[in-house]
């Protein structure tokens, strides 16, 4: 009689996480009598996966009925595979004894687990940045196997090239993580832009996973200011407007100063939105010129999104008015100043010229 051989026909088996893995094993003889055991790994630290003779193995079922006559098939099925199950599995024949002793091992079957990467998470900088600045975005995805993976970056559908990607760990592992950092140059038109991280993996059947970040969370477009004097509304009143254009985000506070003294402060509320996602707003000030003996320097000061204030001034000439109209020597007459603000719809294609 030929000596028993343990046949493991599959050198390797690949299984998707969550599925069952079938590990094939047959013996070539009924002799010697004794049980089959399955181990993961070899040597003294090997892990018992199934013992025909004794033990409780809730995830393991035998493919054939081992009690049946002349059974030589000791293949097993392991349910609900996870990346932690990856490794080399050995089918080992034992010889009956007290205790049973190892008789012969199969050559082993390497089980690899195909695990899907987690949904990519894209995160941007902690603080907003202005156009022309370069900002970094990170993309992370975890838990995938095998290690081979492809990551791409896009901005509004255009592939980016300035990025660095690492897959960890470098050595063998049950599962892997990917971390990538991309550099993006902001433009004034990026309020509606998206940065996309796309991950392709064998487990995704050609349907990559995407993570996105909206540049609206990252960009700050500072406003441009224009202060203009409108035609006289009443004999002694001048309407001065401050047009605040192309800003983002909306958080904005405007202060009027007359000769350096605060006249009024207001917060942008009813704004108009431009096609590019930026906002426009207009505020006006009615100045009673008869209340001023000298020329008035009107300043529109804007604090946008907590940044240092920017301002634009306009010199209001009062010398053209008769002196008696300016007989009120008070430097300011706040009662004469009507508060006002208005929506201002900017033409996106218009060029703005600002005059002091």
């Amino acid at each position: 009689e030929e000596e028993l051989q343990v046949i493991q026909p599959d050198k390797s088996v690949s299984v998707a996480a969550g599925e069952s893995a079938i590990l094939h094993c047959t013996v070539t003889s009924l002799i010697p009598v004794g049980p089959i055991q399955w181990f993961r790994g070899a040597g003294p630290a090997r892990e018992l996966i199934y013992n025909q003779k004794e033990g409780h193995f809730p995830r393991v079922t035998t493919v054939s009925e081992s009690t049946k006559r002349e059974n030589m098939d000791f293949s097993i099925s392991i349910s609900n595979i996870t990346p932690a199950d990856a490794g080399t599995y050995y089918c080992v024949k034992f010889r009956k004894g007290s205790p049973d002793t190892e008789f012969k091992s199969g050559a082993g079957t390497e089980l690899s687990v195909r695990a899907k990467p987690s949904a990519p998470v894209v995160s941007g900088p902690a603080a907003r940045a202005t156009p022309q600045h370069t900002v970094s975005f990170t993309c992370e995805s975890h838990g995938f196997s095998p290690r081979d993976i492809t990551l791409k970056w896009f901005k509004n559908g255009n592939e980016l090239s300035d990025f660095q990607t690492n897959v960890d760990p470098v050595g063998e592992s049950v599962s892997y993580s990917i971390h990538s950092t991309a550099k993006v140059v902001l433009t004034r038109e990026d309020v509606h832009s998206q940065v996309i991280c796309e991950v392709a993996h064998v487990t995704l059947q050609g349907d990559p996973l995407r993570g996105t970040a909206n540049l609206s969370e990252t960009i700050r477009v500072p406003p441009t200011l224009e202060v203009t004097q409108q035609p006289v509304r009443a004999e002694n009143q001048v309407n001065v407007t401050c047009q605040v254009r192309k800003f983002y985000p909306q958080r904005l506070q405007l202060t009027w100063l007359e000769n350096g003294n605060v006249s009024r402060t207001e917060t942008a509320s009813t704004v108009t939105e431009n096609k590019d996602g930026t906002y426009n707003w207009m505020s006006w000030l009615l100045v009673n010129v008869s209340a001023h003996r000298d020329d008035v320097k009107l300043t529109c000061q804007v604090e946008h999104d907590g940044q240092p204030a920017v301002s634009k001034s306009h010199d209001l000439k009062v010398s053209a008015h008769p002196k008696e109209q300016g007989s009120n020597t008070a430097a300011e007459n706040t009662g004469s100043n009507e508060r006002g603000s208005s929506d201002y719809k900017d033409d996106d294609d218009k060029h703005h010229h600002h005059h002091h």
Epitope: L30, I31, V33, Q52, K53, E54, T67, R69, K96
Partner: antibody, heavy 119, light 110 residues
Framework: QVQLVQSGAEVKKPGASVKVSCKAS????????INWVRQAPGQGLEWIAM????????HYNQIFKDRATLTTDTSTSTAYMELRSLRSDDTAVYYC????????????WGRGTLVTVSS | DIVLTQSPDSLAVSLGERATINCRAS??????????IFWYQQKPGQPPKLLIY???NLDSGVPDRFSGSGSGTDFTLTISSLQAEDVAVYYC????????FGQGTKLEIK
């Protein structure tokens, strides 16, 4: 270590029934056949029947088919052999034995249960 | 059913001598290249003990003075050098079909 522990001796009257138990330990009960064999005083071995605890498949010696019933309780790893309509010639030691190689052989044996049938 | 006939019914052998017990089946007990014959030893007051399986394979813990041979319908259990502890009744069993036992052979010391 495989162990088969059988229930104690029984004395029965003719026509009665007896149910002998065999509690298994040291192995996975559902993975191996259990055989029942009897031996009358001074006589040879006589195979009664066998049962696969995994699915309760049974094979009976035709001589005992109408009088013997094998069952198992997998929750307690116990096999049972019930013999009905006892006669005096059923007096014997009844053994359970485990088949370790699925060869329909008897690798490990219990110590036996003496059943005496006497009026 | 397959009937097994052992011979002799009893046997007396001197210590250190060879003892041979035969078992003949009423039809072949061979299947898939295996001979489904088993040999057991039973000492007084004890359950039987498996010695040989599939005609010629020594069970674990059995001294190598015991051996089995044969094929088809004729089988032999041999004790190469009889020891005092070998005194017992020996049974052959077949399982080509459902198990049956031979009638037993009583081995004594001469």
């Amino acid at each position: 270590q495989v162990q088969l522990v059988q229930s104690g001796a029984e004395v029965k009257k003719p026509g009665a029934s007896v149910k002998v138990s065999c509690k298994a330990s040291g192995y996975t009960f559902t993975n191996y056949w259990i055989n029942w064999v009897r031996q009358a005083p001074g006589q040879g071995l006589e195979w009664i029947a066998m049962i696969d605890p995994s699915d309760s498949e049974t094979h009976y010696n035709q001589i005992f088919k109408d009088r013997a019933t094998l069952t198992t309780d997998t929750s307690t790893s116990t096999a049972y052999m019930e013999l009905r309509s006892l006669r005096s010639d059923d007096t014997a030691v009844y053994y359970c034995a485990m088949d370790y190689g699925s060869l329909y052989a008897m690798d490990y044996w219990g110590r036996g249960t003496l059943v005496t049938v006497s009026s | 059913d397959i009937v097994l006939t052992q011979s002799p019914d009893s046997l007396a052998v001197s210590l250190g001598e060879r003892a041979t017990i035969n078992c003949r089946a009423s039809k072949s007990v061979s299947s898939s290249g295996y001979n489904y014959i088993f040999w057991y030893q039973q000492k007084p007051g004890q359950p039987p003990k498996l010695l040989i399986y599939l005609a010629s394979n020594l069970d674990s813990g059995v001294p190598d003075r015991f051996s089995g041979s044969g094929s088809g319908t004729d089988f032999t259990l041999t004790i190469s050098s009889l020891q005092a502890e070998d005194v017992a009744v020996y049974y052959c069993q077949e399982s080509r079909e459902l198990p049956t036992f031979g009638q037993g052979t009583k081995l004594e010391i001469k």
